[in-house]
């Protein structure tokens, strides 16, 4: 059963797909593996706050602490990466704020560039100075834990020297890493001391050890690879938008709704209205009017502009966004002031959202 009654029979489906909207990422919190992360739920007047990660309820455990409006993750790991949400439940409504957590220290090991500069890692020794293998560039090996999005390319490097020149081999989870162990195999560039895996998948997760050896000794170094998987999600609306606004009678005002969506978002601007002096229909559902929606005849649907407003325009404006996965909505209030109460200027006075660090 729909949760509202439409005042007029508005066709909500666009006649053809609207153009893609400029979409906005939710706020991203970045932590290195092992660090602690604290995030404050940026919602006001929350009686009860509940938390989710990737749509699944998040409860306290030995690493996750939920205190009031704060979420603390102790000793973050790449598995903590994802789309988080806090929902503030109030007596009359609820509101959700989304944010991303990214626990990662690099997309790939060593250089992010192609191995154009790798030649300096290939160290030639004076033939008389016999020497066991040693690392020539430990800076490129400091990052041991790598969280990589699925389908990306991973490069692990173990720049080494020695005399005679050492050989390099790779192990996965302590066993010989063979080409047939992964679809598409892998590349080893001996002159750059690197292992390259293209288009990583979850089965590539694990420990990768380079073993560098010659007749005088052997050294090894282990990297841990975690493949961060990606899933489609319902629309995300930027916290704090649309923002409450006020203007005088006759003024103009704009509400903005920033949308982040993998899939085509369908945007509606909705207002509570009265019909026959009542705000609610016989079924007890509120009367709502669709003021604007994305579609063939609609300009930038993320913006609702109101011109020459009257006192009747005061009230709550809802930005409702849907895609094939689900919905999200946020609202703002418009206050219309009599002209004599105009604070300074007559044109719009818009309240900017508060961005809290």
């Amino acid at each position: 059963r729909p949760s509202f009654s439409l005042v007029e029979d508005t066709t909500l489906e666009p006649e053809e797909p609207p153009t893609k909207y400029q979409i906005s990422q939710p706020e991203v919190y970045v932590a290195a593996p092992g660090e602690s992360l604290e995030v404050r739920c940026l919602l006001k007047d929350a009686a009860v706050i509940s938390w989710t990660k990737d749509g699944v309820h998040l409860g306290p455990n030995n690493r996750t602490v939920l205190i009031g409006e704060y979420l603390q993750i102790k000793g973050a790991t790449p598995r903590d990466s994802g789309l988080y949400a806090c929902t503030a439940s109030r007596t009359v409504d609820s509101e959700t704020w989304y944010f991303m957590v990214n626990v990662t220290d690099a997309i790939s090991s060593g250089d992010d560039e192609d191995d154009t500069d790798g030649a300096e890692d290939f160290v030639s020794e004076n033939s008389n100075n016999k020497r066991a293998p040693y690392w020539t560039n430990t800076e490129k090996m400091e990052k041991r834990l790598h969280a990589v999005p699925a389908a990306n390319t991973v490069k692990f490097r173990c720049p080494a020297g020695g005399n005679p020149m050492p050989t390099m081999r790779w192990l996965k989870n302590g066993k010989e890493f063979k080409q047939e162990h992964r679809i598409g195999g892998y590349k080893v560039r001996n002159q750059h001391w690197s292992l390259i895996m293209e288009s990583v998948v979850p089965s590539d997760k694990g420990n990768y050890t380079c073993v560098v050896e010659n007749e005088y000794g052997s050294i090894n170094h282990t990297y841990h690879l975690d493949v961060v998987e990606r899933s489609p999600h319902r629309p995300i609306l930027q916290a704090g938008l649309p923002a409450n606004a006020s203007t005088v009678v006759g003024g103009d005002v704009e509400f903005v709704c920033k949308v982040y969506s993998d899939a085509q978002p369908h945007i509606q601007w909705i207002k509570h209205v009265e019909k026959n002096g009542s705000k609610y229909g016989p079924d007890g559902l509120p009367y709502l009017k669709v003021l604007k929606h994305s579609g063939i005849n609609s300009s930038n649907a993320e913006v609702l502009a109101l011109f020459n407003v009257t006192e009747a325009d005061a009230g709550e404006y809802i930005c409702k966004v849907s895609n094939y996965i689900g919905q999200a909505n946020q609202s703002a209030w418009l206050t219309v002031l009599p002209k004599q109460q105009a604070p300074g200027r007559e044109k719009e006075i818009t309240a900017s959202p508060d961005y809290l660090e």
Epitope: R1, P232, A263, G326
Partner: antibody, heavy 114, light 107 residues
Framework: QVQLVQSGAEVKKPGSSVKVSCKAS????????VHWVRQAPGQGLEWIGS????????SYNQNFRGRATITADKSTSTAYMELSSLRSEDTAVYYC???????WGQGTLVTVSS | DIQMTQSPSSLSASVGDRVTITCKAS??????IAWYQQKPGKAPKLLIY???YRYSGVPSRFSGSGSGTDFTFTISSLQPEDIATYYC?????????FGQGTKLEIK
């Protein structure tokens, strides 16, 4: 883990109605659409409609409008699809799927026969 | 409604072959297309969404590309377990329409 469990097979007479249920678990039921898709024997997939359980918003394929009714019960995390005025060509496997189409029910075979 | 024209309707290939299936939308749908694999008696399985994103756990031999009206689904090296029917689906606007399917067989 995410699961969608559908009700069992049904045999119906032409002109009657059928109501198929889809019980969801392992995720927040109100955060995703539930879609209904059908597949006639040996045929392709046809989208019937969807519901957003949080507020009951529904969307239908015009081919089924008036005959299909999709509802959801938040208290039991269950979605329903009722199809009325059944005819023999409605014989099909009916699937529910989570909003992202990443998880599907096992399917419910509805046979319409006199 | 947006029509999704999928081709070929069936194809036969050998293990290790590169297999390509195409889907053409009657209207521009940006990148709002998904690809599914369905085996007999089973529900469809999501492989690709938003034209090119592999869903979690899907092997890297499956890939998708395209934008607007023309889309391609590729299996880079066919494996015996890939024998199934494959469907495209637009998820831009309702009704979310499917292609008619491509039945893939091993030579």
């Amino acid at each position: 883990q995410v699961q969608l469990v559908q009700s069992g097979a049904e045999v119906k007479k032409p002109g009657s109605s059928v109501k198929v249920s889809c019980k969801a678990s392992g995720y927040i039921f109100t955060s995703y659409n539930v879609h209904w898709v059908r597949q006639a024997p040996g045929q392709g997939l046809e989208w019937i409609g969807s519901i957003y359980p949080d507020n009951g918003d529904t969307s239908y394929n015009q081919n089924f409008r008036g005959r299909a009714t999709i509802t959801a019960d938040k208290s039991t995390s269950t979605a329903y699809m009722e199809l009325s005025s059944l005819r023999s060509e409605d014989t099909a496997v009916y699937y529910c799927a989570r909003g992202d189409f990443a998880y599907w029910g096992q399917g419910t075979l509805v046979t319409v026969s006199s | 409604d947006i029509q999704m024209t999928q081709s070929p309707s069936s194809l036969s290939a050998s293990v290790g072959d590169r297999v390509t299936i195409t889907c053409k939308a009657s209207n521009g749908i940006s990148n709002d297309i998904a690809w599914y694999q369905q085996k007999p008696g089973k529900a469809p399985k999501l492989l690709i969404y938003s034209a090119s994103y592999r869903y979690s756990g899907v092997p890297s031999r499956f890939s998708g590309s395209g934008s607007g009206t023309d889309f391609t689904f590729t299996i880079s090296s066919l494996q015996p377990e890939d024998i199934a029917t494959y469907y495209c689906q637009q998820h831009s606007t309702t009704p979310y329409t499917f292609g008619q399917g491509t039945k893939l067989e091993i030579k």
